[in-house]
């Protein structure tokens, strides 16, 4: 038994880093295989990941950290029973990847404006709650081509834009996601979306 | 209530023996980490020997390298200091202490918060 | 190792007064995010030491609110606001950031 693609981690700089590997043939990952983490730090101990398949020979562990600072570093044992497979490390604020926003709401109460809001995935106590800025995806369902992407680049999660600027009297649909450019994060997952019917009063035209 | 409790202390000669006990109630023992710091006579505090929840971690001053060994018994939610070879300069109280929460993945440090009483070792011929 | 270094060693205090004790490491104790690994204990004449201060600013159970810790990466303040008779005793810092851990060499307060 031998790693095929050594692992690679992924921090949610919170609570959970996931790592990813793959193995050189098929494997039940949670029988053949742990992963053992612990932080480089004094009096820390050892912790099991039990790891799950990701398809035939992929493997994806979920490591439970209690919170992160940027100083940790993370000793990483991959073992197969007694057989030390493979031995790393982990810097988590060096592999950063926000957790999605959520609760993603339109409101199309406000007169010709469309008002977005969403949820920071973080507590006001965790570093990247005011660091975090977004992506806002509008898509039509009914034209592929009516696609586009407004970057939101202040800290409060909302986007105001004009009913006007979608088509009128077809469904959209929304999806956010984040990223902080003070740990050069990755993007975070796609929120789920949410779909509305984008209509308004096109302007009286005077000939 | 959180409580330790030393014993094993007593009067042994340079070259000699001793096992210093700590017994621990009041809280989940093999969730912390120990520590033993010690006190010769007039002087401060200086500090011996770590050990981590599980045992598996130990850590030692320079001093007593080699001849002190920290280990413990959660079964028994007791800890030990084996001392061996002991020297003049080993006189001092024993005091043993809580040391941080390592049943987390970062061992959460809210100081030396609980002591016992102390244990008097004197080494003298 | 990381050095202590206390001072004043001796602190005659008039009860009522306030005090103030001063730590330095050698280096920082800081190991991220402001956890700086430094306490205070308090060793009364003929008992055990008791925890006062833990991560330079936070109080222990019990610890009375006269008693402050600040400070930070490698300057620590100890401070009394209004002495009391009964907080006479040797005062030590302590870093525990690594090992050794090591002591400051003990601030002795006294009541004029």
């Known amino acids: 038994m031998k790693v095929l693609q050594e692992p690679t981690c992924v921090s949610d700089y919170m609570s959970i880093s996931t790592c990813e590997w793959k193995m050189n043939g098929p494997t039940n990952c949670s029988t053949e295989l742990r992963l053992l983490y612990q932080l480089v730090f004094l009096l820390s101990e050892a912790h099991t990941c039990i790891p799950e398949n990701n398809g035939g020979a992929g493997c994806v562990c979920h490591l439970l950290m209690d919170d992160v600072v940027s100083a940790d570093n993370y000793t990483l044992d991959l073992w197969a029973g007694q057989q030390l497979l493979w031995k790393g490390s982990f810097k988590p604020s060096e592999h950063v990847k926000p957790r999605a926003p959520g609760n993603l709401t339109v409101h199309t109460n406000v007169s010709d404006t469309l008002l977005l809001t969403w949820s920071n995935p973080y507590p006001p106590d965790n570093y990247l709650y005011n660091h975090l800025t977004y992506a806002v995806n509008i898509w039509s369902e009914n034209d592929p081509a009516d696609f586009r992407i407004y970057n939101v680049t202040y800290l409060e999660p909302s986007l105001r834009i004009a009913a006007s600027t979608l088509k009128s009297g077809i469904s959209y649909r929304a999806r956010v996601r984040a990223w902080a450019q003070c740990y050069n994060t990755t993007w975070s997952e796609w929120s789920p979306s949410t779909k509305w019917h984008n209509s308004y009063r096109e302007p009286f035209e005077q000939h | 209530e959180v409580q330790l409790v030393e014993s094993g202390g007593g009067l042994e000669q340079p070259g000699g023996s001793l096992r210093l006990s700590c017994a621990g109630s009041?809280?989940?023992?093999?969730?912390?980490?120990m520590t033993w710091v010690r006190q010769a006579p007039g002087k401060g505090l200086e500090w011996v020997s770590s050990?981590?929840?599980?045992?598996?971690?130990?850590y030692y001053a320079d001093s007593v390298k080699g001849r002190f060994t920290i280990s413990r018994d959660n079964s028994k939610n007791t800890l030990y200091l084996q001392m061996n070879s002991l020297r003049a300069e080993d006189t001092a109280v024993y005091y043993c202490?809580?040391?941080?929460?390592?049943?987390?993945?970062?061992?959460?440090?809210?100081?030396?918060?609980?002591w016992g009483q102390g244990t008097t070792v004197t080494v003298s011929s | 190792d990381i050095v202590m270094t206390q001072s004043p060693l001796s602190l005659p205090v008039t009860p009522g007064e306030p005090a103030s004790i001063s730590c330095r490491s050698s280096?920082?104790?800081?190991?991220?995010?402001?956890?700086?690994?430094l306490d205070w204990y308090l060793q009364k004449s003929g008992q055990s030491p008791q925890l006062l201060i833990y991560?330079?600013?936070n109080r222990a159970s019990g610890v009375p609110d006269r008693f402050s810790g600040s400070g930070s990466g490698t300057d620590f303040t100890l401070k009394i606001s209004r002495v009391e008779a009964e907080d006479v005793g040797f005062y030590y810092c302590?870093?525990?950031?690594?090992?050794?851990?090591?002591f400051g060499q003990g601030t002795k307060l006294e009541i004029k």
């Open positions: 280096q920082s104790l800081d190991y991220s995010s402001g956890y700086n690994y």
């Open positions: 302590m870093q525990s950031l690594q090992t050794p851990y090591t």
């Open positions: 050990i981590s929840g599980s045992g598996s971690n130990t």
């Open positions: 991560l330079a600013s």
């Open positions: 202490a809580r040391d941080r929460l390592t049943a987390a993945v970062r061992p959460y440090y809210y100081g030396l918060d609980v």
């Open positions: 009041g809280f989940t023992f093999r969730d912390y980490a």
